[in-house]
C-alpha cells in the first residue's frame, strides 16, 4: 500500500480529520446514505466505503478535506489487502479448525448478537 | 432464522461440538483449505464458510456432526441476515459519520493491524 | 495413497538443459504449492524453486535464479522443472515435494538423479 | 536470507537414550519451522510442522518446541529406527532454508 505512514497512525489522523471537517461534510442536509444498523462493523466495509464515495462526490473539495477523502481510500487498500488475504493461503484441516474455532470464539464473546 | 435458541446460545453450542468432533474432522491428511492469515475474522466469513462447505463434503455424516455443520449453517444465515442489514437503511450524513467514527475507532482499537 | 514420482534425471554436459518431471496422485494437486528440493552427493538439503497453486507465483534459489523454469500442469497433475546452463554443482539428486505454505514439504518423491559432467 | 544453523553436526547415542537437536534462525521466524528425517538412499520424511505439530503417523517420542530464533527437536527415548539425518527448515519466507543437518549415530 503506497502510503508513507503506518495504518495505524493513518486511521489515528483520519478519525482527527472526521472531527475537523465535521460541519463541512454534513452541509448537505437532503443526503441520505446507507447506514449498517448493527455493530459489527467489519461485516459491513463494502457499504461503509459506498458511502464514503457518495459523501466525496457531494463534499466541495480542497486543503484537508482533500487529505480526510485520501487517507479513506488508504484505509479501503488495507482492508482490501486485508480480504485478499482469506483465501491466499491452504492449510491442513487442523489449522482450518483452529480458525473457526476461534473465529466463533470472537463471536461468542465480542459480536453484539441480536436475540 | 428458523432457530429455535438464539444465535448466542447456539454459537455456544457449536464450540462444544466442534471440540467434540475435532478428531474425525480431521481424518482427511490430505485435504488443504484456504485459511485467513490475519485475525479479523469478519472480513472473511465468505472463505469461512466455503471452507465449512469443503469440510462438510469430505465429512461423514451422521450423529452428532450433522448437528454441528446444521448448526454452522444456521450461524450462516445469522451472519448473511447481518450482511443484509448493511446496506438497508439510508440516514442522514450525521448518522453516517457516526457510524463511520465508530468504525474508525474500532479499527484504531480493536484491529490487529500489520505494520 | 499420496505418490510423486520424479522422472527425467540422467548425465548431461556443462552447459546443457535437462526437464524433470513430478506426476502426482493420491491427493488434490492444485490445492498444494509444489516445490523442487535438491540434495548433492553427501551434502545436506538445499530448496531450489516453489510454484503457487495456480501456477502464477514463482520462487527460486539465488544459485538456479534465471537458469531454471519452474512449472506446473494442474490438468496433468504434474510438476516440471526445466533446467538450463546446467553447471557441475547443479550434480545432485532433485526430489519433488508438495508444501503446505507456512508449514512444510509434508510429502516427497523418490528422486532423480541429474548428474553434470564432461 | 534467513540462514538456519543446527547443532550438533553429529550426535552418537544409544537405544533408550533422550536426544535433544537445536535449530537457530538468524531472524525471528515465529513458529514457521519444520522438522525432517532422512535416512541413506530415501527421500527426506516430515515429522513436525509448525514448530511442534506431529505430523500423522509419525510417533510420539518425537517433540518439537521453541519460538522466534530458537527451537528444539527432541527424541524422548531413541529407537533403532531413529538412527539417521535430521533436518530443520525455516517455513516463514522465500527462499526456503534448511539446517546443516544432524546426524544420529550409534554409540
Known amino acids: 500500500i503506497p502510503t508513507e505512514i503506518p495504518t495505524s497512525a493513518l486511521v489515528k489522523e483520519t478519525l482527527a480529520l472526521l472531527s475537523t471537517h465535521r460541519t463541512l461534510l454534513i452541509a448537505n442536509e437532503t443526503l441520505r446514505i446507507p447506514v449498517p444498523v448493527h455493530k459489527n462493523h467489519q461485516l459491513c466495509t463494502e457499504e461503509i466505503f459506498q458511502g464514503i464515495g457518495t459523501l466525496e462526490s457531494q463534499t466541495v473539495q480542497g486543503g484537508t478535506v482533500e487529505r480526510l477523502f485520501k487517507n479513506l481510500s488508504l484505509i479501503k487498500k488495507y482492508i482490501d489487502g486485508q480480504k485478499k488475504k482469506c483465501g491466499e493461503e491452504r492449510r491442513r484441516v487442523n489449522q482450518f479448525l483452529d480458525y473457526l474455532q476461534e473465529f466463533l470464539g470472537v463471536m461468542n464473546t465480542e459480536w453484539i448478537i441480536e436475540s | 432464522i428458523p432457530t429455535e435458541i438464539p444465535t448466542s446460545a447456539l454459537v455456544k453450542e457449536t464450540l462444544a461440538l466442534l471440540s467434540t468432533h475435532r478428531t474425525l474432522l480431521i481424518a482427511n491428511e490430505t485435504l488443504r483449505i484456504p485459511v485467513p492469515v490475519h485475525k479479523n475474522h469478519q472480513l472473511c466469513t465468505e472463505e469461512i464458510f466455503q471452507g465449512i462447505g469443503t469440510l462438510e463434503s469430505q465429512t461423514v455424516q451422521g450423529g452428532t456432526v450433522e448437528r454441528l455443520f446444521k448448526n454452522l449453517s444456521l450461524i450462516k444465515k445469522y451472519i448473511d441476515g447481518q450482511k443484509k442489514k448493511c446496506g438497508e437503511e439510508r440516514r442522514r450524513v450525521n448518522q453516517f459519520l457516526d457510524y463511520l467514527q465508530e468504525f474508525l475507532g474500532v479499527m484504531n482499537t480493536e484491529w490487529i493491524i500489520e505494520s | 495413497e499420496v505418490q510423486l514420482v520424479e522422472s527425467g534425471g540422467g548425465l548431461v554436459q556443462p552447459g546443457g538443459s535437462l526437464r524433470l518431471s513430478c506426476a502426482a496422485s493420491?491427493?488434490?494437486?492444485?490445492?498444494?504449492?509444489m516445490a523442487w528440493v535438491r540434495q548433492a552427493p553427501g551434502k545436506g538439503l538445499e530448496w531450489v524453486s516453489s510454484i503457487s497453486y495456480e501456477g502464477d507465483i514463482t520462487y527460486y534459489g539465488d544459485s538456479v535464479k534465471g537458469r531454471f523454469t519452474i512449472s506446473r500442469d494442474n490438468s496433468k497433475n504434474t510438476l516440471y522443472l526445466q533446467m538450463n546452463s546446467l553447471r557441475a554443482e547443479d550434480t545432485a539428486v532433485y526430489y519433488c515435494?508438495?508444501?503446505?505454505?507456512?508449514?512444510?514439504?509434508?510429502?516427497w518423491g523418490q528422486g532423480t538423479l541429474v548428474t553434470v559432467s564432461s | 536470507d534467513i540462514q538456519m544453523t543446527q547443532s550438533p553436526s553429529s550426535v552418537s547415542a544409544s537405544v533408550g537414550d533422550r536426544v535433544t537437536i537445536t535449530c537457530r534462525a538468524s531472524?525471528?521466524?515465529?513458529?514457521?519451522l519444520s522438522w525432517y528425517q532422512q535416512k541413506p538412499g530415501k527421500a527426506p520424511k516430515l515429522l513436525i510442522y509448525g514448530t511442534s505439530n506431529l505430523e500423522v503417523g509419525v510417533p510420539s517420542r518425537f517433540s518439537g518446541s521453541g519460538s522466534g530464533t530458537d527451537f528444539t527437536l527432541t527424541i524422548s527415548s531413541l529407537q533403532p529406527e531413529d538412527f539417521a539425518t535430521y533436518y530443520c527448515l525455516q517455513d516463514k519466507e522465500f527462499p526456503r532454508t534448511f539446517g546443516g543437518g544432524t546426524k544420529v549415530e550409534i554409540k
Open positions: 493420491g491427493f488434490t494437486f492444485s490445492h498444494y504449492y
Open positions: 531472524q525471528d521466524i515465529a513458529n514457521y
Open positions: 515435494a508438495s508444501q503446505t505454505l507456512r508449514e512444510s514439504f509434508d510429502y
